[in-house]
């Protein structure tokens, strides 16, 4: 068991200045009663349970849900429950999404603005790009590993008797017909949105029109805002509005502390929702399942499929993802993990990495040391565009359709299907089902049918879930490679690039004790600027 | 070379049963999917459906569900169509037809046909 | 299921003419256009996939053109051996789908 963390005279865990000039405890990693330390006597099996109850609870609710779901299916199911009472069953889930996405855009905007600020541009070019070439590294190798699973496994001529079943018609309407390069313009579009405003609600996408020239029909895109928030574009501008802000100076620096300040006051908002998070992603998972039809039928028939899909997020998010963690800081990769269990629950049951970035940033700063402004500048750009599960799904989706519909795949395809996944998974930004949508992209690059597109909607609502738990775990780790990073560099120089926003009053330094609606975290603040200390964890590591 | 040999002529009374088999040489037989396509003597011509060689799964059109079976005996590479209580309105040659592995739905090699004719 | 219309049931030109025969799809199949040949009570064979593309062993003077829902085959120098029925057929969506085929004779 490791000991509890030193405390001064005044009873406070002793802490250490972080990168970013503020305090953190003293080897957060090291700690570690609940990530693999051993809980002996009542006491220490109190504190265990104490600082892991959420950890616990959200694991509880993710095991209870799919229990109650598959017991409410076989007493009947949506149709037994009836249209009012499975609304009042889907309710309590329907409003964890809803205080999640409530929350989506004040954090990314501020977040982002506050870390950009408080980067020098060397730093922030640096940590931006060590951050994107994670991304693309990882989501590259996920990319390889569902391919080459499913060229292994065969998941299509496995299923192929689903063909069958489902009819020669398939279902292509489904599909969403949509011309590469239009797709890609898009993603451009987004990112440079028109109107701030429409992009906290709206995102561009062309769609066509069939319009009669001189007596041909020719198909014309049009351009229009569909529903759906645009956090690609919002992501960007934050971190653009940011840089600028840092080149003002110190006439930046009070709308800096404005940001800083929405920032932290988000938080606690952040903390309070974790606490109703185990009941909402309980009767998410539950509801999803009661809503299914035919669940049995479905396992029956594209059982390899999904197979492929959860086997390759498992070896992606269990063995590779840790051990490129492991290579680069000698740390032990599952304790980081335990501090992100609650995030990876609620990434299970909302299916949105946009939704589980609040508890992420909050999980990750508090459960395994990784620094305010390192969190806040890469987690929501990893949310936005790294996505690991999607590619992985993908790749397998579009190997599986091959197979299914008995098309060959030479390298060149192969090699196309990799870069297209890769590439179309960064538009994918955090929208629940995005992926289904740039598999049509990845079919028509290596000229597939996309008829079957309709099987791999049947099950996304399972696969789509284990892709956003292995998209927010990328993301995690690479905010903690990052945080590494900058402890390695920062040993190593004496002056510090990351720099913290300094106050101009003096503050007072002595620790007033605030709630945070977490009965089990007791905050201090240190001086004007510094990063909050804990005197407990969620997980204490 | 690639060829698909088809068997003869059929004439059959309403209500028998017909087998029509298509022997593949030239390809590893597996590799590809065999597509049956329909045409009704002065008519254009209409799939019935194909059968995954791999897999052995057969998957029907639409019009082509019920009465119409699919085979493989994947050992002597050869596909088989037959139909059950046989109709008039079955009158028709059939085509075997190898499918393409690649862009999507088309058929690069066809049988010579097989002549069908249901009469009392 | 996707509708191909051929509107010429029926064409006649003279040995070296350049012969088009069209093809219109009753909606967008992204160039999954292909043609065949049909001699009379002969076997059927692939000209051309893709649009625009040639199989092996069909003549060069064959080719096709394209994109939406409006197709065409060409034969640049009619020779007597092309006289047969030509279906186009697309391969977007299942189920595939025929023209009702053009038939070609000499003037």
């Known amino acids: 068991m490791v000991a509890d963390p030193p405390r001064d005279s005044k009873g406070l865990a002793a802490a250490e200045p972080t990168a970013n000039g503020g305090l953190a405890l003293a080897s957060i990693e090291d700690q570690g009663a609940a990530a693999g330390g051993y809980c002996g006597s009542r006491d220490q099996v109190r504190r265990c349970l104490r600082a892991n109850l959420l950890v616990l609870l959200t694991v509880v609710a993710v095991v209870a849900g799919v229990a109650l779901g598959l017991g409410v299916s076989g007493a009947g199911g949506a149709l037994a429950l009836g249209p009012e009472r499975l609304s009042a069953f889907v309710f309590p889930g329907e409003l964890l999404l809803r205080l999640l996405r409530m929350i989506i855009l004040p954090l990314v905007v501020c977040s982002l603005i506050g870390g950009a600020a408080s980067l020098d541009p060397g730093a922030l070019g640096r940590l931006g790009a060590w951050a994107l070439l994670f991304f693309l590294v990882t989501t590259l190798l996920a990319s390889a590993l569902g391919v080459g699973l499913a060229l292994a496994l065969q998941p299509g001529a496995a299923s192929a008797a689903i063909n069958a079943s489902v009819g020669a018609a398939g279902s292509a309407e489904n599909a969403p017909s949509k011309e590469v390069l239009d797709s890609f313009l898009d993603l451009a579009r987004n990112i440079f949105p028109s109107n701030l405003v429409s992009a906290a609600f709206r995102s561009y996408s062309t769609t066509y029109e069939e319009r009669n020239i001189t007596g041909t029909r020719v198909k014309v895109p049009v351009g229009q805002e569909v529903e759906g928030m645009n956090i690609l574009g919002l992501v960007v501008f934050a971190i653009v509005f940011g840089v600028a802000l840092r080149k003002l100076g110190p006439e930046g620096e009070l709308l800096i502390r404005f940001f800083n300040s929405f920032n932290e006051a988000t938080m606690v908002l952040v903390s309070w929702i974790m606490w109703y998070a185990p009941v909402g992603i309980l009767f998410l998972v539950a509801s999803k399942i009661v809503e299914m039809k035919d669940v049995r039928q479905l396992f029956i028939s594209l059982g390899k499929y999904i197979l492929c899909c959860l086997l390759g997020h498992a070896i992606h998010g269990l063995l590779v993802l840790p051990l490129i963690y492991f290579l680069f800081t000698r740390k032990n990769p599952y304790r980081f993990l335990w501090g992100i269990v609650t995030p990876l629950a609620t990434a299970f049951g909302t299916s949105s990495s946009s939704a589980t970035l609040p508890l992420m940033m909050k999980c990750v700063e508090e459960n395994n040391g990784v620094a305010k402004h390192i969190s806040r500048f890469i987690l929501p750009i990893g949310a936005t565009v790294n996505m690991d599960g999607a590619a992985l799904f993908q790749c397998v989706a579009a190997v599986f359709i091959a197979q299914l519909s008995q098309q060959s795949l030479d390298f060149v395809k192969i090699i196309t299907i990799l870069v297209t996944a890769t590439a179309s998974s960064v538009g994918a930004a955090g929208i629940p089902a995005g992926g289904v949508l740039t598999l049509a992209i990845i079919l028509e690059a290596v000229n597939l049918p996309v008829d079957h597109i309709s099987l791999i909607l049947a099950v996304d609502w399972l696969v789509d879930r284990s892709c956003t738990v292995l998209n927010v775990e990328g993301d995690a780790l690479g905010a903690g490679l990052l945080q590494n990073y900058v402890d390695r560099t920062e040993s190593r120089s004496t002056e510090p690039e990351l720099i913290q926003v300094k106050s101009e009053l003096p503050l007072d330094p002595l620790p007033v004790p605030t709630e945070e609606g977490n009965p089990l975290l007791k905050h201090y603040r240190g001086p004007a600027g510094d990063a909050t200390v804990a005197s407990e964890k969620e997980s204490v590591m | 070379q690639i060829q698909l040999v088809q068997s003869g002529p059929e004439l059959k009374k309403p209500g028998e049963t017909v087998k029509i088999s298509c022997k593949a040489s030239?390809?590893?037989?597996?590799?590809?999917?065999m597509s049956w396509v329909k045409q009704v003597p002065g008519k254009g011509l209409k799939w019935m459906g194909w059968i995954h060689t791999y897999a052995g799964v057969p998957i029907y059109g639409d019009d082509f569900k019920g009465r119409f079976a699919f085979s493989l005996e994947t050992s002597a590479s050869t596909a088989y169509l037959q139909i059950n209580n046989v109709k008039n309105e079955d009158t028709a040659t059939y085509f075997c037809?190898?499918?393409?592995?690649?862009?999507?739905?088309?058929?690069?090699?066809w049988g010579q046909g097989t002549t069908l004719t249901v009469s009392s | 299921d996707i509708q191909m219309t051929q509107t010429t049931s029926s064409l006649s030109a003279s040995l070296g003419d350049r012969v088009t025969i069209s093809c219109r799809a009753s909606?967008?199949?992204?160039?999954?256009l292909n043609w065949y040949q049909r001699k009379p009570h002969g076997t059927v064979k692939l000209l051309i996939y893709?649009?625009?593309r040639l199989h092996s062993g069909v003549p060069s003077r064959f080719s096709g053109s394209g994109s939406g829902t409006d197709y065409s085959l060409t034969i640049s120098n009619l020779e007597q051996e092309d006289i047969a029925t030509y279906f186009c057929?697309?391969?977007?969506?299942?189920?595939?789908?025929f023209g009702g085929g053009t038939k070609l004779e000499i003037k």
């Open positions: 893709y649009t625009s």
């Open positions: 030239g390809y590893t037989f597996t590799t590809f999917g």
């Open positions: 037809a190898r499918r393409s592995d690649n862009y999507r739905y088309f058929f690069d090699y």
């Open positions: 909606q967008d199949i992204r160039n999954y």
């Open positions: 057929q697309q391969g977007h969506t299942l189920p595939p789908t």
